[in-house]
Every structure is written in C-alpha cells, then in structure tokens.
C-alpha cells in the first residue's frame, strides 16, 4: 500500500510470522510507530514496534505464535496498519488488506551440510524452515557457488524447479575452497518472492591423487 511517498510492504513466512517494512520520505523523527495486524476470521491480533533500518525506513516482525504453528490459511485476509503516535493519539499512516498466501517469503533454508565431497564434485543437502504443509511439494530452489576470486553476484544461479533439498555440484576444481548458498520460493502467490539466501556453507574439494590423470 502506498500513501503519497509512503511505502508499506509485508511478507508472510507461511507459518507464524509477518515481516513488514515501512518507508516514508521526510520521515517523522523521534516518533513511536507500530504495525498492527487484525485478521478478518481469527481471534488473535498482534502488534510490533517499528525500528529504524535506514534514514527513512523501519521494519518489524509480527510474531503470531510458536514458530511452526499454522496461524493463517488461504482464506484469511489480515488488515495491516502502520500507526504512529501523535501526542496522545495514534494516527494511521498506511493500511493494507494483506492476503498472506499471495505475499509469501519463506525463511532461509537451514542445516546445510556436505553429504559427500570428491575432487570434482560435491553433494550438499539442506532443510527448509517453518514452511507450511500447504505447499506439499510446490516449492522451487535457487543455488549458487562462490569460486575463488569471484563475488556472489558473479556466481551463476542453479535452478531446481521442484522440492529437492539437495544438489550435486559438478566440474569443481580439486583442492579448492568454495562457498555455497541456497534459497527457496513457493510457487503460490502473486507477490511471493525468494527467501533470503541461506548462511554460506564452506567446503573444500579433495586434492587430486598424485600421479593420477585429472
């Protein structure tokens, strides 16, 4: 929802968290602001305090329940409001009718580990975190590998168009240090976006055996 020069963007992690960012040009200084969530069909409501992340933007996480509890469904709409204190009252700065399963951003994949490493290849696995059972297998992944002397931005993206929580990296250089990251996205939702990248997993390929042709 955009009000003049104000932008209010939120994502649902598919379980029990809605993360919001509010940005406003000519922002109000030293003012207390919060996000209030009011679902149309459920009994709970929730508030979080907006904290500055830059000169003109604030962020907060609405914690709806235990991390793995399913607090919203595809039938729900949540009214989200940015409220800022003006003297003794609260002023509505931004508002949106939020459809959680149209605005998904999952948590970054976790528990990355090297399953098997050789001179030229490495098998890596991971797990998804706090992802709704509603998706069943309707997820996709992107992965990237950082090679020596390159940046993450230069790393080619590998796309896994199905729920596959492992990858076999090929054509690697022996005895070389690499880093690996993966991210996940549900296929559902008009405004759904990629999760953050996972924490990088560092690994080293095995050295080529002496006297062997590699």
């Amino acid at each position: 929802a955009v009000n003049g020069t104000s932008q209010f963007t939120c994502f649902y992690n598919s379980r029990a968290n809605i993360s919001c960012v509010w940005s406003q040009d000519g922002a109000l200084q030293d003012t207390s602001c919060q996000v209030h969530a009011w679902p149309d069909r459920r009994r709970w409501n929730q508030t979080c305090e907006l904290l500055p992340v830059s000169q003109a933007s604030w962020a907060c996480n609405l914690i709806l329940g235990a991390p793995d509890s399913q607090k919203l469904t595809t039938v729900d709409i949540v009214t989200l409001r940015v409220l800022c204190r003006e003297g003794v009252r609260w002023r509505v700065m931004a508002i949106q009718d939020f459809k959680p399963f149209e605005n998904l951003r999952l948590m970054a994949p976790i528990s990355l580990q090297v399953v098997h490493v050789e001179t030229h290849r490495c098998n890596i696995s991971w797990e998804i975190s706090q992802a709704s059972h509603y998706f069943e297998r309707h997820l996709e992944f992107e992965a990237r590998t950082l090679s020596p002397g390159h940046t993450w931005e230069e790393a080619p993206l590998l796309t896994l168009k199905q729920k596959q929580e492992w990858i076999c990296l090929e054509t690697l250089t022996p005895d070389t240090q690499y880093e690996f990251q993966v991210r996940v996205k549900p296929l559902q939702g008009e405004f759904t976006t990629w999760s953050p990248w996972s924490q990088p997993l560092a690994f080293r390929t095995k050295p080529a055996a002496l006297g062997k042709d590699t």
């Epitope: 149309d40 459920r42 009994r43 509890s69 399913q70 469904t73 595809t74 039938v75 059972h133």
Partner: antibody, heavy 116, light 107 residues
Framework: QVQLVQSGAEVKKPGASVKVSCKAS????????ITWVRQAPGQGLEWMGD????????NYNEKFQGRVTLTVDTSISTAYMELSRLRSDDTVVYYC?????????WGQGTLVTVSS | DIQMTQSPSSLSASVGDRVTITCRAS??????LNWYQQKPEGTLKLLIY???GLHSGVPSRFSGSGSGTDFTLTISSLQPEDVATYYC?????????FGQGTKLEIK
C-alpha cells in the same frame, strides 16, 4: 451481547425464490464475516457461503453457486441469503452465524418449506 | 473438498462419565478445527475453536485436542444438559465442511 435474529418461517412453491434475513446486534457488524449454513430435517450441517459486511466480499459453496446470493445492508446491520429456483430438497432450516475463529454466535434458524 | 468423518455416530453414557468423540479430516488442516453443540430444539453453540480454544461461557469440562488430521472432543464428566448432537467443522479452506454429527444420549 451479540445477537443474530433471523426472519420467520416461509412456505414457497418449487421454482420460486426465498430471501432470509439475519439482523445482527451487540457488535460492529462490518468487522466480522457472516456465514450461512443449512440443515435438512434429521441431517447434518452444510456450509453455503459467507459475506464480509465491511467490503461485500463473498465466498460460495460451489454446490449452490448460481442459486444463492448473499448481501448485506450495513445501515441496518442485516445480512440476507437469497436462494432461487427452489426445489423440494431445499426444504431445510437455514442458519446465519458470525465467524470469529469458528462460528461463535448463531441465529435461531429459519425453516423454509418448498411445496407445491 | 475436505471430508470430515466423526465417530461414533451415536453414543449413550452415564452422568459423570468421561466421553470422547473423534473427528478425522481427509487432509491436513493443521489446527483449524471447531466443535459445535446442537441441542434437540435446534440451538447451535460453538464449544471449541482452533482445536483447543474454549469459547467464552463454555464449561471447562469440555476440551479439545489434536492436530493435522485427527481431533478429539472430550467431556470430562458428563452432565444431563450435555444431551445434544456434536459436530466438528474445518475452517482451513473453502468450502467449510462439517462432520456428520455424533448424537449423545444419557443412559
């Protein structure tokens, strides 16, 4: 206290339409979904659809799609369920209910009899 | 559509008994399961919402549990006024669906 009061029993001919009303009081009418459920004599409960008075948004059970229309008049805090092309198997009790994490308050029910 | 199956369809118990009614969903509905009581005259009341939440004004002898596909309504000590038909209902997805009901009688 929250109350939902429905209109009285109706007798209709096959092919006709019926419009049942549900007057809400004791809460902010525009802030909660109103759902409609029906029950044939001696049978279970069947969800027909729901409406959000604040926006007029509706959801319908496909079984009744095209025959049922849900509306509201927010000025008098009243929801309506209209069922058209009535058949003998529409002889049931119709209930309205407020939705808030379950159907937390119910109307008393309206018996509609379809008979030639 | 999600099918809801209740068991038993009827039961008879004595005052003071512990009574259990089960409800099974045809697919995972997380905790989006509610229980209702319908008295013989037709009055409907919400007892339990979101699997285990006790609706206001409902006696504490009623409780709910479960997750995913299997759910239970328990009456810890049956009272004469509990004679009714009990329904489970999922509000995980449209169309909302109900179990076929469990008719509870006093021996």
């Amino acid at each position: 206290q929250v109350q939902l009061v429905q209109s009285g029993a109706e007798v209709k001919k096959p092919g006709a339409s019926v419009k049942v009303s549900c007057k809400a009081s004791g809460y902010t009418f525009t802030s909660h979904w109103i759902t409609w459920v029906r029950q044939a004599p001696g049978q279970g409960l069947e969800w027909m659809g729901d409406i959000y008075p604040g926006s007029g948004n509706t959801n319908y059970n496909e079984k009744f799609q095209g025959r049922v229309t849900l509306t509201v008049d927010t000025s008098i805090s009243t929801a309506y369920m209209e069922l058209s092309r009535l058949r003998s198997d529409d002889t049931v009790v119709y209930y309205c209910a407020r939705e808030r994490g379950g159907f937390d308050y119910w109307g008393q029910g309206t018996l509609v009899t379809v008979s030639s | 559509d999600i099918q809801m199956t209740q068991s038993p369809s009827s039961l008879s118990a004595s005052v003071g008994d512990r009574v259990t009614i089960t409800c099974r969903a045809s697919q995972d509905i997380s905790n989006f399961l509610n229980w209702y009581q319908q008295k013989p005259e037709g009055t409907l009341k919400l007892l339990i919402y979101y699997t285990s939440g006790l609706h206001s004004g409902v006696p504490s002898r009623f409780s709910g549990s479960g997750s995913g596909t299997d759910f239970t309504l328990t009456i810890s000590s049956l009272q004469p006024e509990d004679v009714a038909t009990y329904y489970c209902q999922q509000d995980n997805n449209h169309p909302y669906t109900f179990g076929q009901g469990t008719k509870l009688e006093i021996k």
